[in-house]
Interface confidence: medium
């Protein structure tokens, strides 16, 4: 059955982030009320035109490649960029649009038969055999500056919290990072015991809102170290 009859708050369609933080595998993440549970099989977020974060070319569309948006930019921040057309500069094959490849730093036509095998290999490297669906991709133009400056709404794909609208932060949700609500008083939060542990979460929570801090819930003081529940509390 398709459990997609939802009200307008699009984040409710996201896969339920239960088990959320690495430090609290048993506690529910209150991203939004009414989140769907497995049984139905489709969940969809709101449409958005935020820069799409990526770690490698295969995570982008067929007409895109993964790179830092600025020349010599932060290597840790990469997004899907529109592919380079023929005669444009390139550093690797993936930068060139379909039907082209990178030769001596320039995108050239790959009409030559000897290159076909390499293109096929790149396509099948993607998860799923895309041969049947490649035709379904429409041509995409480069990102306009408007796309970069639109603040993401709840559920929008993001790179960092500054990409999100007020009251939202950028946090991981399964594989991607999306805009989620900043936590309110009383909501469960994640207290990171060691530096860098935030990156281990598959479903990250936002941080606590202004005037709040993430502390052990009073009635959980007696609980064992691993099961202590943290909530957003007034300073």
């Amino acid at each position: 059955t398709l459990n997609s009859v939802l009200n307008s708050n699009a984040i409710k369609n996201l896969p339920p982030p239960l088990g959320g933080a690495a430090g609290h595998p048993g506690s529910a993440v209150s991203a939004a009320p009414g989140i769907l549970y497995p049984g139905g099989n489709k969940y969809q977020t709101i449409d958005n035109y935020q820069p799409y974060p990526c770690a490698e070319d295969e995570e982008c569309g067929t007409d895109e490649y993964c790179a830092s948006p600025t020349r010599g930019g932060d290597a840790g921040v990469q997004i899907c960029l529109a592919c380079r057309k023929r005669r444009k500069r390139c550093m690797r094959h993936a930068m060139c649009c379909p039907g082209n490849y990178c030769k001596n730093g320039i995108c050239v036509s790959s009409d030559q038969n000897h290159f076909r095998g390499e293109i096929e290999e790149t396509i099948t490297e993607s998860f799923g055999n895309d041969h049947s669906t490649l035709d379904g991709y429409s041509r995409r133009t480069t990102l306009s500056s408007k796309m970069y400056h639109t603040k993401g709404q709840e559920g929008s794909v993001c790179l960092r919290s500054s990409d999100c609208a007020s009251g939202l932060c950028c946090a991981r949700h399964f594989w991607s990072k999306i805009c989620k609500p900043v936590l309110k008083e009383g909501q469960v939060c994640t207290k990171h015991r060691r530096k860098g542990s935030h990156g281990l979460e598959i479903f990250q929570r936002c941080y606590c809102g202004e005037g709040l801090s993430c502390r052990i819930q009073k009635d959980h003081h007696q609980a064992s170290n691993s099961s202590r529940l943290h909530t957003c509390q007034r300073h």
Partner: nanobody, 124 residues
Framework: EVQLVESGGGLVQPGGSLRLSCAAS????????MGWFRQAPGKEREFVAA????????RYADSVKGRFTISADNSKNTAYLQMNSLKPEDTAVYYC?????????????????WGQGTLVTVSS
């Protein structure tokens, strides 16, 4: 319509192994990642493992690291979860999930699809 069908669940003794499969059909978009989640009786559902589309990047829950291995067969649109050194606490319904781009652009809405689950029971 996209369908994810899990198989490979069953009864196994502690210390034993099982291999779960998740076959995807009706795909008209490109996956970004596939993963496994599980829900034990009376407990919240939890993340187990995930693999990105190219298969080069994987993530695991701390509780299964070193015991479970996620992999994917591109040609069959199938993801696998090899579960070794199983413990009674691994008993749960295991769900397959997929995160995908829209069919025309990765900036389209992200789409999430779920399977119906397969039961894994670890008991002597």
């Amino acid at each position: 319509e996209v369908q994810l069908v899990e198989s490979g669940g069953g009864l196994v003794q502690p210390g034993g192994s099982l291999r779960l499969s998740c076959a995807a059909s009706g795909i008209t978009f490109r996956f970004k990642a596939m993963g496994w989640f599980r829900q034990a009786p009376g407990k919240e559902r939890e993340f187990v493992a995930a693999i990105n589309r190219s298969g080069r990047s994987t993530r695991y829950a701390d509780s299964v690291k070193g015991r479970f291995t996620i992999s994917a067969d591109n040609s069959k649109n199938t993801a696998y979860l090899q579960m070794n050194s199983l413990k009674p606490e691994d008993t749960a319904v295991y769900y397959c999930a997929a995160e995908s781009h829209g069919s025309t652009s990765p900036r389209n809405p992200l789409q999430y699809d779920w399977g119906q689950g397969t039961l894994v029971t670890v008991s002597s």
